[in-house]
């Protein structure tokens, strides 16, 4: 699993000892202002309402497991998901729904109705996003459900469908 | 008023004195890198264009008063509002508008037209969001106006309609 | 070119020497936790798919040149663009597309179909946004392409169309 991360991460570096002990600049650079983030693109082939994600995205201080982002450091996180839909309109309108789940509980959802004219058109594009600001403990899981996952456009726009989290304020 | 906040907030903790004076890790943990944030859900019953919010959301370094978030620490803030609409389409199209106001001035608005086919349908869902990056002084007010507040879906989706701010960079 | 910035920016202030050497609060306030951000509004008159921006927006640690934001400090950036469209519907549906480019490469795009009923209506409003979390090196360029730039509403809503970036985590 690739973990794109900022070089020289200060994690787990002792503040005392070594050549750093008298150098405040050195000490400050190693200070415990932890940052954690993830930015994953949706998996190419989706076959269920709980979305899967590409493990080879950016993961720093966050794990990915079975469709879940798993938090490793407690704190206040900003969570955002954005999906690109491509709908072949049937005879009726279609409700596109994106659900953000924390520990399997739906914490936030976004809905948009497309194909509302009831006409069978060639295609309709729709972009849907949802954000959340929440305090997450260690091992909290973040996941996304989409009932109409078949309309998520993973072929034309492989980079458009993302789930991202970043730590805003830790609890140290 | 409940103020969900991260434990061990460093606010107003002296940097010198006590057992901390010789321990740089301790000192750094108490350093003055202030964080302020809010995350409020819309009130259940809306009766005017200026939206009201539930006071029992997350408030840390920000006050809530009469539909306004009131800033307590100056700095550059990221402000984001997201609303979920459910429209029973009349015979005509409907323009949904979300206005973000700073000190009563409309600083940003988002508009989306729904029911554009002019057909009376059962319902149309629409999600609307707006963000702003702005420098806010102490006592600056942040509020949201929605002309078509009657379409904000507070019953089916009580958690979806939120106003959030967080301090990106303070002026210390 | 205007560069609105937070006062007392810690950039390039030495950590040692002067009256600050013994005062940890002073030292911490000057610590190298660099922040960079930009918040630009779209130019009034657009004449090509690559959007131009008003140079008199917020620029701090980021340059603007020929439609590009140019990164000056490496790190993980949050990039967000939001556009307000106003479409006089023709006889057919219209696909609105927003492309975020990094070094001229399309990294993310958002599409929405409007006027899907195929009826010539007076107008249809649509708001489109796109975000990206990406590691950017020095001199990386960030730009936005919109094929249907003629529909971007710069007259009714002069403040609505923005491109913003802010540094989440630097590489020191």
């Amino acid at each position: 699993q690739r973990t794109d991360s900022i070089p020289n991460s200060p994690d787990n570096i002792p503040l005392r000892g070594g050549n750093c002990s008298e150098d405040l600049l050195c000490i400050l650079k190693r200070a415990p202002f932890k940052k954690s983030w993830a930015y994953l693109q949706v998996a190419k082939h989706l076959n269920k309402t709980k979305l899967s994600w590409n493990k080879d995205g950016i993961l720093h201080g966050v794990r990915y497991q079975d469709g879940n982002l798993v938090i490793q450091f407690p704190g206040l996180y900003f969570i955002i998901c954005q999906l690109q839909f491509l709908v072949q309109c049937p005879n009726n309108s279609v409700d596109l729904k994106l659900e953000l789940l924390i520990n399997k509980h739906i914490k936030k959802q976004a809905l948009v109705t497309v194909c509302e004219s009831g006409m069978q058109t060639k295609h309709v594009y729709q972009n849907l996003s949802q954000f959340l600001l929440d305090y997450l403990q260690v091992n909290t899981t973040v996941s996304v459900n989409v009932d109409t996952f078949q309309y998520i456009d993973t072929s034309t726009f492989p980079l458009e469908n993302v789930l991202s989290v970043f730590l805003y304020s830790n609890s140290d | 008023q409940r103020t969900d906040s991260i434990p061990n907030s460093p606010d107003n903790i002296p940097l010198r004195g006590g057992n901390c004076s010789e321990d740089l890790l301790c000192i750094l943990k108490r350093a003055p890198f202030k964080k302020s944030w809010a995350y409020l859900q819309v009130a259940k019953h809306l009766n005017k264009t200026k939206l009201s919010w539930n006071k029992d959301g997350i408030l840390h370094g920000v006050r809530y008063q009469d539909g306004n978030l009131v800033i307590q620490f100056p700095g550059l803030y990221f402000i984001i509002c997201q609303l979920q609409f459910l429209v029973q389409c009349p015979n005509n199209s409907v323009d949904l508008k979300l206005e973000l106001l700073i000190n009563k001035h409309i600083k940003k608005q988002a508009l989306v037209t729904v029911c554009e086919s002019g057909m009376q349908t059962k319902h149309v869902y629409q999600n609307l969001s707006q963000f702003l990056l702005d420098y806010l002084q102490v006592n600056t007010t942040v509020s949201v106006n929605v002309d078509t507040f009657q379409y904000i879906d507070t019953s089916t989706f009580p958690l979806e309609n939120v106003l959030s701010v967080f301090l990106y960079s303070n002026s210390d | 070119q205007r560069t609105d910035s937070i006062p007392n920016s810690p950039d390039n202030i030495p950590l040692r020497g002067g009256n600050c050497s013994e005062d940890l609060l002073c030292i911490l306030k000057r610590a190298p936790f660099k922040k960079s951000w930009a918040y630009l509004q779209v130019a009034k008159h657009l004449n090509k798919t690559k959007l131009s921006w008003n140079k008199d927006g917020i620029l701090h640690g980021v340059r603007y040149q020929d439609g590009n934001l140019v990164i000056q400090f490496p790190g993980l950036y949050f990039i967000i663009c939001q556009l307000q469209f106003l479409v006089q519907c023709p006889n057919n549906s219209v696909d609105l597309k927003l492309e975020l480019l990094i070094n001229k490469h399309i990294k993310k795009q958002a599409l929405v179909t409007v006027c899907e009923s195929g009826m010539q209506t007076k107008h249809v409003y649509q708001n489109l946004s796109q975000f990206l979390l990406d590691y950017l090196q020095v001199n990386t360029t960030v730009s936005v392409n919109v094929d249907t730039f003629q529909y971007i509403d710069t007259s009714t809503f002069p403040l609505e169309n923005v491109l913003s970036v802010f540094l989440y985590s630097n590489s020191d």
């Epitope: - | 420098y135 | 205007r2 560069t3």
Partner: antibody
Framework: EVQLVESGGGLVQPGRSLRLSCAAS????????MHWVRQAPGKGLEWVSG????????GYADSVKGRFTISRDNAKNSLYLQMNSLRAEDTALYYC?????????????????WGQGTLVTVSS | DIQMTQSPSSLSASVGDRVTITCRAS??????LAWFQQKPGKAPKSLIY???SLQSGVPSRFSGSGSGTDFTLTISSLQPEDFATYYC?????????FGGGTKVEIK
């Protein structure tokens, strides 16, 4: 009590220079944007120039662009207008006005206080 | 530049009358509009900001409305001290611009 007192006006020949000052008191000067507005005899109001709280955002009317320079000294609670290459049409009463906002990212919020003005007459 | 057009340029009214002055912007300015009152030989006085918000100390008979391009200043019951010239101003973008003014005279 908020007070804005303009000074530096007077009679000047075309092509010459003049520097106007505005002394502010009764509020935190460095927390607000400031502006210059002028009014020619018997005419309406014309905005001349504005400056944000930290001088990062500065704007001018087309009629004075390249000739006038606005500045401020927050330590002295003072606003200035350096007027070069003066013309007869610059003859006016010049007002200093305080903004309710800071001027950062268009945080202009309207003028809430005005000075009494200083008269500038450009004539040969 | 954004042009601000005020109408009428002058009007005559009596004490107790309801007076309405309109201001139109050449393009959208959201609600970034102010109204000022000026009496002969005096500095302008701020009445309204953000199109409809009353400056502190201004009597409640003054009210403002509008958003986008069309705005209105209303004096619900004209008082003797209200006879003056009124200006609108946009401050959404440089250059800030004023309307030409409306002179309210005694009938």
């Amino acid at each position: 009590e908020v007070q804005l007192v303009e000074s530096g006006g007077g009679l000047v020949q075309p092509g010459r220079s003049l520097r106007l000052s505005c002394a502010a008191s009764g509020f935190n000067f460095d927390d607000y944007a400031m502006h210059w507005v002028r009014q020619a005899p018997g005419k309406g109001l014309e905005w001349v120039s504005g400056i944000s709280w930290r001088s990062g955002n500065i704007g001018y009317a087309d009629s004075v662009k390249g000739r006038f320079t606005i500045s401020r000294d927050n330590a002295k609670n003072s606003l200035y207008l350096q007027m070069n290459s003066l013309r007869a049409e610059d003859t006016a009463l010049y007002y200093c006005a305080k903004d309710k906002g800071i001027g950062f990212n268009w945080n202009y919020e309207g003028f809430d206080y005005w000075g009494q003005g200083t008269l500038v007459t450009v004539s040969s | 530049d954004i042009q601000m057009t005020q109408s009428p340029s002058s009007l005559s009214a009596s004490v107790g009358d309801r007076v309405t002055i309109t201001c139109r912007a050449s393009q959208g300015i959201s609600n970034h509009l102010a109204w000022f009152q000026q009496k002969p030989g005096k500095a302008p006085k701020s009445l309204i900001y953000a199109a409809s918000s009353l400056q502190s100390g201004v009597p409640s008979r003054f009210s403002g409305s509008g958003s986008g391009t069309d705005f209105t200043l209303t004096i619900s019951s004209l008082q003797p001290e209200d006879f003056a010239t009124y200006y609108c101003q946009q401050y959404v973008t440089y250059p800030l611009t004023f309307g030409g003014g409306t002179k309210v005279e005694i009938k």
